[in-house]
């Protein structure tokens, strides 16, 4: 089978601090040494890129400094964390994996993780 399968959890609940983490696992059909991982957000059939990182197998993922994502890799598994989430960011987050080098190129796209974000209630003023 030449197609690449990507697995990710169906649902994740963000923490009260607006942080959501999930694992993106891919079944590699090739011996890739350079992998690109992209997180996409799908809302109302519109797809936008949230963040992306390219890494060498065995090394850590490096997202851009201003990225809302961080992550670690272990074999064919990537642990992704998205921070700074608010209720309006609730949506389907898709893990896209590309085996970039050596050729041939392979693409794998997960079914998406529905991330629910609930804004924390403001603390009521208290009298002491």
């Amino acid at each position: 089978c030449k197609a690449m399968h990507v697995a990710q959890p169906a649902v994740v609940l963000a923490s009260s601090r607006g942080i959501a983490s999930f694992v993106c696992e891919y079944a590699s059909p090739g011996k890739a040494t350079e992998v690109r991982v992209t997180v996409l957000r799908q809302a109302d059939s519109q797809v936008t890129e949230v963040c992306a990182a390219t890494y060498m197998m065995g090394n850590e993922l490096t997202f851009l400094d201003d990225s809302i994502c961080t992550g670690t890799s272990s074999g064919n598994q990537v642990n992704l964390t998205i921070q700074g989430l608010r209720a309006m960011d609730t949506g389907l987050y898709i893990c896209k994996v590309e085996l970039m080098y050596p050729p041939p190129y392979y693409l794998g796209i997960g079914n998406g993780t529905q991330i629910y974000v609930i804004d924390p209630e403001p603390c009521p003023d208290s009298d002491f």
Epitope: A3, H5, L40, P104, Y106, I109
Partner: antibody, heavy 118, light 107 residues
Framework: EVQLVESGGGLVKPGGSLRLSCAAS????????MNWVRQAPGKGLEWVSS????????YYADSVKGRFTISRDNAKNTLYLQMNSLRAEDTAVYYC???????????WGQGTMVTVSS | EIVLTQSPATLSLSPGERATLSCRAS??????LAWYQQKPGQAPRLLIY???NRATGIPARFSGSGSGTDFTLTISSLEPEDFAVYYC?????????FGPGTKVDIK
């Protein structure tokens, strides 16, 4: 408006060279991988080459490997295809196409005709 | 290289009829399959990606189905502007390959 416009096609003799250009507008060119696809007269579509957003990764069809070179200039929002050692079988309309975020070729140019004949 | 086979080569139908086009891959492409429409003298236009997702602006009469090696593009009721050539493409691995096309013409 999202647009791709190819140029540089023409008539060239076998063994000759040609450089095609594809000018992009209406989107952040530097964020997308790009492709060249060709179509011989009356025939189907054939993928030629692909280049990643930062030019780090390049792929070619076996039929053009060693003869064609894909490149891009993100500052100029332009994709290129340098074609050397041209053969009669390279005669085709050449299209540039953008790779959408989900993988398919979502935006295509109108094409430029390349004719290789003596 | 993944080889895509399309059938039939030509489909002769009348406006209002249902068109069913088939695409078969030589090995599994999962759901990394797209359908394109091409009219004479024009560039291809993306219709369907991910085997079943309509691209932006594509009418609901176009639908795609299938996964693995067998795929179908259905046009529920042909409009005059739908008579064209349709190509399937796999984009899951390089080299990216296209099927030979199915021509839908007016009976």
């Amino acid at each position: 408006e999202v647009q791709l416009v190819e140029s540089g096609g023409g008539l060239v003799k076998p063994g000759g060279s040609l450089r095609l250009s594809c000018a992009a507008s209406g989107f952040t060119f530097s964020s997308y991988s790009m492709n060249w696809v060709r179509q011989a007269p009356g025939k189907g579509l054939e993928w030629v080459s692909s280049i990643s957003s930062s030019s780090s990764y390049i792929y070619y069809a076996d039929s053009v490997k060693g003869r064609f070179t894909i490149s891009r200039d993100n500052a100029k929002n332009t994709l290129y295809l340098q074609m050397n050692s041209l053969r009669a079988e390279d005669t085709a309309v050449y299209y540039c196409a953008r790779v959408g975020l989900m993988g398919p070729f979502d935006i295509w140019g109108q094409g430029t005709m390349v004719t290789v004949s003596s | 290289e993944i080889v895509l086979t399309q059938s039939p080569a030509t489909l002769s139908l009348s406006p209002g009829e249902r068109a069913t086009l088939s695409c078969r891959a030589s090995q599994s492409v999962s759901s990394y399959l797209a359908w394109y429409q091409q009219k004479p003298g024009q560039a291809p236009r993306l219709l369907i990606y991910g085997a079943s997702n309509r691209a932006t602006g594509i009418p609901a009469r176009f639908s795609g189905s299938g996964s693995g090696t067998d795929f179908t593009l259905t046009i529920s009721s042909l409009e005059p502007e739908d008579f064209a050539v349709y190509y399937c493409q796999q984009y899951g691995s390089s080299p990216f390959t296209f099927g030979p096309g199915t021509k839908v013409d007016i009976k």
